[in-house]
């Protein structure tokens, strides 16, 4: 039975040209996290394998940095980066948990940042 829950940074906004941290946190389960895939709509951004480390998709290498933790940092944001992002936690034996984050990239110099949290 899947008992875990995913907390995410929720809906966030950032300025064009700036950077943002996407973070998810899986809690309330003892399942082993084998891999976390980060996706934008239906496109792979990055993979963090618990044992083997990070892989950044070639088309995002210039603008995506791993971390902090299992999170992902997006840099040099453009308006085209606006949209849904998913953290997909592949766990054993539970299965797959998915978290959703909506990012809005604003032209304006006043971008309200949604609540963010630090994972200890």
């Amino acid at each position: 039975m899947m008992t875990g829950t995913i907390e995410t940074t929720g809906n966030i906004s950032a300025e064009k040209g700036g950077s943002i941290i996407l973070q998810c946190h899986l809690s309330s389960t003892t399942a082993q996290v084998t891999q976390v895939n980060w996706e934008q709509q239906d496109q792979l951004l990055a993979i963090c394998n618990a044992d083997l480390g990070w892989h950044i998709s070639p088309s995002f290498k210039d603008r995506v940095a791993p971390g902090p933790g299992l999170g992902l940092t997006l840099q040099s944001l453009t308006v085209n980066d606006t949209g849904e992002y998913f953290c997909i936690y592949h766990t054993y034996p539970d299965g797959t948990y998915t978290g959703r984050i909506f990012l809005e990239v604003l032209e304006s110099s006043v971008a309200e940042h949604g609540a963010r949290f630090q994972i200890p």
């Epitope: 084998t34 891999q35 895939n37 996706e39 239906d42 792979l44 993979i47 394998n49 892989h55 998709s57 070639p58 088309s59 997909i88 592949h90 299965g95 797959t96």
Partner: nanobody, 116 residues
């Protein structure tokens, strides 16, 4: 329905070689990674090798680096693990796992036993 079938395990002497295969059927188009994990008695399942579908990057655990080689035949939907210079500590059940944009699927496992 996704099916992963491993083969190639068995009993081998230390220093020997084995080649594991994992044939997949029913996998959706958006494959992300293909990998090999292993689980020794009383231990957690650990990732030992991974190949990505976007650019074929390969990753290895330090414990197998230089001895194991992962490869994929996309036309056959099959991933391989060539294991050379096997050691008794490589004894485990070996599982293949594929991730897609929908989830992760596991094979049933194949036993590898390395005798000294």
């Amino acid at each position: 329905e996704v099916q992963l079938v491993e083969s190639g395990g068995g009993l081998v002497q230390a220093g020997g070689s084995l080649r594991l295969s994992c044939a997949a059927s029913g996998i959706p188009a958006s494959i992300r990674t293909m990998g090999w994990f292993r689980q020794a008695p009383g231990k957690e399942r650990e990732g030992i090798s991974l190949i990505t579908s976007d650019d074929g990057s390969t990753y290895y655990a330090d414990s197998v680096k230089g001895r194991f080689t992962i490869s994929a035949d996309n036309a056959k939907n099959t991933v391989y693990l060539q294991m050379n210079s096997l050691k008794p500590e490589d004894t485990a059940v070996y599982y293949c796992a594929w991730t897609t944009n929908r989830g992760m699927d596991w094979g049933q496992g194949t036993q590898v036993t390395v005798s000294s």
